[in-house]
C-alpha cells in the first residue's frame, strides 16, 4: 500500500539526483586540478543530508553548511561575474573568458545548476512527484535556500571589481526580488570590493537607448553607493558582436569598441 | 554494501581481443567512475582509464589510446573494458575500481588475462 | 605523465616494529596522493588518501604524511596481517600514477 505523501504546486525532484549530483562532481573535480583533494562521496553525502528526512519547508542555511565547508573554493580578484535574468548569456561568456566566473563555474553551483530536490520529514526518501514551490508552497524550500546560501557565500568571498550581467529587454533591469538583488548586492564587502560594475544587455537589434539610465539601474547605484562600493555600467549593445569579440579580441570590427561607459 | 563482480580468466591469441565484465551492486552505479587498473605478473599496477557512466564520459591513458574501449550498461550496472591487438605484454590481472574522486576505495576481484599463442 | 618511485623496494622488518615506507613524486601532486595495500592474490586495498586521511575502517597504526614532492607511509607497529605490498599513487594529474611498490616482508 504506497503511504501517503505530501503533494507540493511545484516540479518533483529531477530524475536521477543522486547520481547526477555525483557524476557532475567527479567530472568537476577531475578538471579543476584545486579541487582534487573532493571526495565526491562526502559531498554526495553532505548535500543528501541537507534536506533528506526533514521538512521541505523548513529548510535552513545551516542545513547546507557541511556542504558549502566541503565546497569552499575562491575566485581571483576582480574574476568574479554575477548575473540576473541572463543565465545562458552569461555562461557563455565564461566558457569564452576562462578567466571569468558565475556560481553555475564553482563546485556546488555546478552541481545544483538546473536540479530540483526535497525530500519528507522522517523517510529517507527523496520526493520525485513534487516539491515545494517557492511562491505557492513555501520559500525556506531546499532549492531556494540552497541558492540563497551558495549565493551569499559567492558575494561575500568577491574582492575587486566585481561584474554582474543584467537583461536589460527585462521591465526591471535590476530587480531587487531577484536573487542578485535580495541576496548578492547585500553580500559584496566594501573593504574587498572597490566597484561594482553592471553590463546591460540589450535584446533588440535596433535598441540604441542608454539603458544605464534606467530608474532600476539608478536605483541599483543608489544601494551600492551607499555601501561605499563604487558603480559603473556598460551597455552591451549587440551581445552577439560582444560573444564574438571576447573570442577573438583581435577582429577589426571590434577594435571601435562595442559598448558605452557610464562612471559613476 | 558496494561491491564489484567480475568476470572470469581469458586466455586470448595474440592479435585478438578480450572484453572483461564488471558487475556493480550498491546505490548510483552511475555517477560514480569505474576505472580499469592493470597488474602484469610480479609488476605494478597501471591505471588504463575510466568511465563515468551517466555522461558517458571516458578518460584514457595515453599508453592505451585507440586499443582500448571502456563502456557501461546503466541498465545492469555493469561496466566493460574491451583491450584490442593484445599481445603477450598484456599478460596481466585486470581490476576495475569505483572511485568517487582520485583514489580508488573499491575494488573488483580481478580478471587474469594470459595472451598466449 | 608524473613518475611514482617508492623506496625501498623491500623492507625487512619484526613484528611489533615500525615500518617507513617513502614515495617520490617526480613533480609536485600537492597532497593528492593515496596509499594500498595489497596481499599475494587479493585486491589492492586503499589506506590512505589526501596523503593522510585514513580510509574508513583502517586500523590507527597506519599514518600518512608528507605533500608535494615527498610522502611517508608509516605503520607504527606492525602486525602479522600487515606484511604485504604497499603501493603508493598520485591523482593530482592525469593519467594517474602508482609506484612500483614497496614489499614488506618478516626479518
Known amino acids: 500500500v504506497p503511504r501517503w505523501r505530501q503533494q507540493w504546486s511545484g516540479s518533483g525532484t529531477t530524475s536521477r539526483f543522486p547520481e547526477t549530483v555525483l557524476a557532475r562532481c567527479v567530472k568537476y573535480t577531475e578538471v579543476h586540478p584545486e579541487m582534487r583533494h573532493v571526495d565526491c562521496q562526502s559531498v554526495w553525502d553532505a548535500f543528501k543530508g541537507a534536506f533528506i528526512s526533514k521538512y521541505p519547508c523548513n529548510i535552513t542555511e545551516e542545513d547546507y553548511q557541511p556542504l558549502v565547508k566541503l565546497g569552499t573554493q575562491t575566485v581571483p580578484c576582480n574574476k568574479t561575474l554575477l548575473w540576473s535574468r541572463i543565465k545562458d548569456l552569461a555562461h557563455q561568456f565564461t566558457q569564452v573568458q576562462r578567466d571569468m566566473f558565475t556560481l553555475e563555474d564553482m563546485l556546488l553551483g555546478y552541481l545544483a545548476d538546473d536540479l530540483t530536490w526535497c525530500g519528507e520529514f522522517n523517510t529517507f526518501e527523496i520526493n520525485y512527484q513534487s516539491c515545494p514551490d517557492w511562491r505557492k508552497d513555501c520559500s525556506n524550500n531546499p532549492v531556494s535556500v540552497f541558492w540563497k546560501t551558495v549565493s551569499r557565500r559567492f558575494a561575500e568571498t568577491a574582492c575587486g571589481v566585481v561584474h554582474v550581467m543584467l537583461n536589460g529587454s527585462r521591465s526591471k533591469i535590476f530587480d531587487k526580488n531577484s536573487t542578485f538583488g535580495s541576496v548578492e548586492v547585500h553580500n559584496l564587502q566594501p573593504e574587498k570590493v572597490q566597484a561594482l560594475e553592471a553590463w546591460v544587455i540589450h535584446g533588440g537589434r535596433e535598441d540604441s537607448r542608454d539603458l544605464c539610465q534606467d530608474p532600476t539601474i539608478k536605483e541599483l547605484e543608489s544601494i551600492i553607493s551607499k555601501r561605499n562600493i563604487r558603480f559603473f555600467c556598460k551597455n552591451i549593445y549587440r551581445p552577439d558582436k560582444f560573444l564574438q569579440c571576447v573570442k577573438n579580441p583581435e577582429d577589426s570590427s571590434c577594435l571601435s569598441g562595442i559598448h558605452h561607459h557610464h562612471h559613476h | 554494501q558496494v561491491q564489484l563482480v567480475q568476470s572470469g580468466a581469458e586466455v586470448k591469441k595474440p592479435g585478438s581481443s578480450v572484453k572483461v565484465s564488471c558487475k556493480a551492486s550498491g546505490d548510483f552505479f552511475s555517477g560514480y567512475a569505474i576505472n580499469w587498473v592493470r597488474q602484469a605478473p610480479g609488476q605494478g599496477l597501471e591505471w588504463m582509464g575510466r568511465?563515468?557512466?551517466?555522461?558517458?564520459?571516458?578518460y584514457y591513458a595515453q599508453k592505451f589510446q585507440g586499443r582500448v574501449t571502456i563502456t557501461a550498461d546503466e541498465s545492469t550496472s555493469t561496466a566493460y573494458m574491451e583491450l584490442s591487438s593484445l599481445r603477450s605484454e598484456d599478460t596481466a590481472v585486470y581490476y576495475c575500481a569505483r572511485s568517487a574522486a582520485g583514489w580508488f576505495a573499491y575494488w573488483g576481484q580481478g580478471t587474469l588475462v594470459t595472451v598466449s599463442s | 605523465e608524473i613518475v611514482m618511485t617508492q623506496s625501498p623496494a623491500t623492507l625487512s622488518v619484526s613484528p611489533g616494529e615500525r615500518a617507513t615506507l617513502s614515495c617520490r613524486a617526480s613533480q609536485s601532486v600537492s597532497s593528492n596522493l593515496a596509499w594500498y595495500q595489497q596481499k599475494p592474490g587479493q585486491a589492492p586495498r586503499l589506506l590512505i588518501y589526501g596523503a593522510s586521511t585514513r580510509a574508513t575502517g583502517i586500523p590507527a597504526r597506519f599514518s600518512g604524511s608528507g605533500s608535494g614532492t615527498e610522502f611517508t607511509l608509516t605503520i607504527s607497529s606492525l602486525q602479522s596481517e600487515d606484511f604485504a605490498v604497499y603501493y603508493c599513487q598520485q591523482y593530482n594529474n592525469w593519467p594517474w600514477t602508482f609506484g612500483q611498490g614497496t614489499k614488506v616482508e618478516i626479518k
Open positions: 568511465i563515468i557512466p551517466l555522461l558517458g564520459d571516458t
